[in-house]
C-alpha cells in the first residue's frame, strides 16, 4: 500500500530572465527513493538517480542546474517555459509517486509564489 | 579483499572494436554502481561511463557516445565496456572503479590496475 | 557540463611542508567533491570523499574542506610518499569530471 505524500511548491510564477527552484518532497513513507525524474509535459528534463547522481537532458543542460537536494533550477527563464513540471519519484517498495507544479512565467516584476500543496 | 581485474586491452586499428572485463570480488557487486575512466598516455583521467547497480542506468562521456558500451553481468560479478568504431584518441590505459554512489557522496572507492588500449594502423 | 579547474598544476615541496591545492567548480556542487592521488603507472587512489571525509585506511595528514564551488586538499607535512599526481573529481552529475591534476615534486 502507497501511504507517501509528495509535497511540491505548488503553482508559481516567476520573471522572464531569471530563475526558479522546482521542488518536491516525499513524505510519510519509509519506501526508498531510487531515482527522481523530473519532466516538462512529456520531456525529460533531468534525472538524480540514488547511485549515480544527476543527469541532465542535453537539450537542457545551459539552462537547467541540478538542486539544491532533489530540486531542479530552472535558469535564463523565458515565456516558453509556463507550463506543467513533474517531479517522479521511482521508490522501492512503493512504486511511483508524482508530484505537480504549475510554473508561469511573466514579463513584468509581479512574481510570486503560490501557496503549497499535497499531491497523494 | 576487494579487488577488481581488467582484462581485453591490446593493440587494434583504427575503426576496430575491443571488449573489456573488469572481474570484481571482495563486495556485493550488484549493489554498487560502476565506472570505467580512462587516461591518455601523459594526460589526465578521463571519465568514459557509468552503469548502474542494477544495469537499468548507464551514462556516457560526449566522446564516447554512441561508440562504446557499458554494461554488467551481476551474477558473474563483471562490468564490461565494448568498444566498437576506435579512434587513435581512445589509446589509454582503461580503468574499472567502484563507484560513485550519491546517497552516500562516495566516490570512487576501488580501482583496476588498468588495460591498455592502442589504437593503431 | 560541470568544468573543475585546479591549481597549481604542479609544485615544489620539501618534507615536513604544508601543502595546499585547491579546486574550482564551474557551478555548486555542493560537497560532491572527491580527491585522488594517483603514482607513476599505478592506478589513482580515494584519499577524500564528500569534500572532507577521509577515506578509510589513508592517513590521517590528508584533509579536506570546501562546498559550493570551491575546494582544498591539505597535507599537513608532507612526506616522501607523498609526491605524486593529485586530482580532484566532482561526483554530483555526469559527465563526472576531473581537475587537470596537481604533480607535488621534490624540491
Known amino acids: 500500500m502507497m501511504t507517501g505524500t509528495i509535497e511540491t511548491t505548488g503553482n508559481i510564477s516567476a520573471e522572464k530572465g531569471g530563475s526558479i527552484i522546482l521542488q518536491c518532497h516525499l513524505s510519510s513513507t519509509t519506501a526508498q527513493v531510487t531515482q527522481v525524474n523530473w519532466e516538462q509535459q512529456d520531456q525529460l528534463l533531468a534525472i538524480c538517480n540514488a547511485d549515480l547522481g544527476w543527469h541532465i537532458s542535453p537539450s537542457f543542460k545551459d539552462r537547467v542546474a541540478p538542486g539544491p537536494g532533489l530540486g531542479l533550477t530552472l535558469q535564463s527563464l523565458t515565456v516558453n517555459d509556463t507550463g506543467e513540471y513533474f517531479c517522479i519519484y521511482h521508490t522501492y517498495p512503493d512504486g511511483t509517486y508524482t508530484g505537480r507544479i504549475f510554473l508561469e512565467v511573466l514579463e513584468s516584476s509581479v512574481a510570486e509564489h503560490g501557496a503549497r500543496f499535497q499531491i497523494p | 579483499e576487494v579487488q577488481l581485474l581488467e582484462s581485453g586491452g591490446g593493440l587494434v586499428q583504427p575503426g576496430g572494436s575491443l571488449r573489456l572485463s573488469c572481474a570484481a570480488s571482495?563486495?556485493?557487486?550488484?549493489?554498487?554502481?560502476m565506472s570505467w575512466v580512462r587516461q591518455a598516455p601523459g594526460k589526465g583521467l578521463e571519465w568514459v561511463s557509468a552503469?548502474?547497480?542494477?544495469?537499468?542506468?548507464?551514462y556516457y562521456a560526449d566522446s564516447v557516445k554512441g561508440r562504446f558500451t557499458i554494461s554488467r553481468d551481476n551474477s558473474k560479478n563483471t562490468l564490461y565496456l565494448q568498444m566498437n568504431s576506435l579512434r587513435a584518441e581512445d589509446t589509454a590505459v582503461y580503468y574499472c572503479a567502484k563507484g560513485p554512489r550519491y546517497q552516500d557522496r562516495a566516490g570512487m572507492d576501488v580501482w583496476g590496475q588498468g588495460t591498455t588500449v592502442t589504437v593503431s594502423s | 557540463d560541470i568544468q573543475m579547474t585546479q591549481s597549481p598544476s604542479s609544485l615544489s615541496a620539501s618534507v615536513g611542508d604544508r601543502v595546499t591545492i585547491t579546486c574550482r567548480a564551474s557551478q555548486s556542487i555542493s560537497s560532491y567533491l572527491n580527491w585522488y592521488q594517483q603514482k607513476p603507472g599505478k592506478a589513482p587512489k580515494l584519499l577524500i570523499y564528500a569534500a572532507s571525509s577521509l577515506q578509510s585506511g589513508v592517513p590521517s595528514r590528508f584533509s579536506g574542506s570546501g562546498s559550493g564551488t570551491d575546494f582544498t586538499l591539505t597535507i599537513s607535512s608532507l612526506q616522501p610518499e607523498d609526491f605524486a599526481t593529485y586530482y580532484c573529481?566532482?561526483?554530483?552529475?555526469?559527465?563526472?569530471?576531473f581537475g587537470g591534476g596537481t604533480k607535488v615534486e621534490i624540491k
Open positions: 573529481q566532482q561526483s554530483l552529475a555526469t559527465p563526472y569530471t
Open positions: 571482495g563486495f556485493t557487486f550488484s549493489t554498487y554502481a
Open positions: 552503469i548502474s547497480g542494477s544495469g537499468g542506468s548507464t
